[in-house]
């Protein structure tokens, strides 16, 4: 079999073998080594030399095999469009930013650029469980049967309607979506307005 | 326009099953929840089931939990009503019908302003 | 649940007439109050949302007005074609319930 060629190699068709770690030097018609990631260019390549990589200084970075001569800057993440750092600038990657709690990704080119307030859910309501934390605005669904949520709220979530007899009460009111259950003590009388709505 | 088109609706047997589709276009499907209702030969209308846009949350009536399953295709454009263990009192035209979001309403909730559009309906007679 | 209670459940009237038909909830319900109307053999039509916000393409005689647990439907001068079944549904807690339906004839 014959031998692997080792970059720097001559090229004839203007495609390299490792389409991620090789790249075609069009000057030379050759096929020279990416940079790993985390370094950079510092030498290019010749048809006698390959590609010589250098370490990414502090506080920048390369994420890819990259035949790139200069090193990104490390960004912080904005406070300022809402977002907050989750993991911090590596050499080998990005700083890793997203939403602040109770924010939603508004704005999104490549990674989200800017976060705003999620709508509150009105009474009788809570938000949709979504997949991913931050990734759209609330969608607010109604409680289900026999639950209740009595605020207006982002994150508020729809709660069981008490039992009154599970604390030894009888039930005054029944339940709304938007309302708990109300109990009252057996031996107390009906409000006048009420009275012979209750089952005895 | 917006159009409802119901199918699936048939004859079957009591304990059997049967998948009613409802194809929807004119609106952007993905965006509203979807809404099952049924009227039962000479009666009122009962509301049956309900599904929120993305499919991830579902209601029932009392009368149908267990045994009815509402899902949604967003690719096709299409709410489905899976019935099993049918039952003759389950006999009725079943409409679906596309949920009212008024345009001047700030706080985005889909729920509580009833149905728009209608379906022309699907006929589900359950008998042996 | 939320039971709702139509009356009159039927109602004759005439061409010109102003008619009202009522809803009660069994609970408060807010605004969150729909009306339907449906003709033999069709399917509902959409006619008021939130107790007395008008559907696109409902004709002006139509009104709704109430709010808490009770609800009214005005047709202000009834016209042939509004002869139907007329329904209210509350979308106020799950499980959404309709009356019983109010069947409007002429007289």
């Known amino acids: 079999s014959q031998p692997q060629a080792v970059p720097p190699y001559a090229s004839e068709n203007q495609t390299c073998r490792d389409q991620e770690k090789e790249y075609y030097e069009p000057q030379h018609r050759i096929c020279c080594s990416r940079c790993p990631p985390g370094t950079y260019v510092s030498a290019k390549c010749s048809r006698i030399r390959d590609t010589v990589c250098a370490t990414c200084a502090e506080n920048s970075y390369n994420e890819h095999w990259n035949y790139l001569t200069i090193c990104q800057l490390c960004r912080p993440c904005d406070p300022v469009m809402g977002l907050e750092e989750i993991a911090p600038c590596t050499s080998k990657r990005k700083t890793q930013c997203r939403c602040q709690p109770g924010m939603f990704c508004a704005a999104w080119a490549l990674e989200c650029t800017h976060c705003e307030l999620l709508s509150d859910c009105p009474p009788g309501t809570e938000a949709e469980l979504k997949d991913e934390v931050g990734k759209g605005n609330n969608h607010c669904v109604p409680c289900k049967a026999g639950h209740f949520q009595n605020t207006s709220s982002p994150s508020a979530r729809c709660q069981p309607h008490t039992r009154c007899e599970n604390q030894g009460l009888v039930e005054a009111a029944p339940g709304t979506a938007q309302s708990d259950t109300t109990c009252k003590n057996p031996l107390e009388p009906l409000p006048p307005e009420m009275s012979g709505t209750m089952l005895m | 326009e917006v159009q409802l088109l119901e199918s699936g609706g048939g004859l079957v047997q009591p304990g059997g099953s049967l998948r009613l589709s409802c194809a929807a276009a004119?609106?952007?499907?993905?965006?509203?929840?979807m809404t099952w209702v049924r009227q039962a030969p000479g009666k009122g209308l009962e509301w049956v089931s309900l599904?929120?846009?993305?499919?991830?949350?579902?209601y029932y009536a009392d009368s149908v939990k267990g045994r009815f399953t509402i899902s949604r295709d967003t690719s096709k454009n299409t709410l489905y009503l899976q019935m099993n263990s049918l039952r003759a009192e389950d006999t009725a035209v079943y409409y679906c019908?596309?949920?009212?979001?008024?345009?001047?309403?700030?706080?985005?909730?889909?729920?509580?302003?009833?149905?728009?559009?209608w379906g022309q309906g699907t006929t589900v007679t359950v008998s042996s | 649940d939320i039971q709702m209670t139509q009356s009159p459940s039927s109602l004759s009237a005439s061409v010109g007439d102003r008619v009202t038909i009522t809803c009660r909830a069994s609970?408060?319900?807010?605004?969150?109050l729909n009306w339907y109307q449906q003709k033999p053999g069709k399917a509902p039509k959409s006619l008021i949302y939130?107790?007395?916000s008008l559907q696109s393409g409902v004709p002006s005689r139509f009104s709704g007005s109430g709010s808490g647990t009770d609800f009214t439907l005005t047709i202000s001068s009834l016209q042939p074609e509004d002869f139907a079944n007329y329904y209210c549904?509350?979308?106020?807690?799950?499980?959404?319930?309709f009356g019983q339906g109010t069947n409007l004839e002429i007289k």
């Open positions: 609970q408060d319900i807010s605004n969150y």
């Open positions: 019908a596309k949920n009212h979001y008024p345009d001047d309403v700030i706080i985005k909730n889909y729920y509580f302003y009833g149905v728009d559009v």
């Open positions: 939130a107790a007395s």
């Open positions: 549904q509350q979308t106020h807690t799950i499980p959404y319930s």
């Open positions: 599904i929120s846009p993305s499919g991830a949350t579902t």
């Open positions: 004119g609106f952007t499907f993905s965006s509203y929840p």
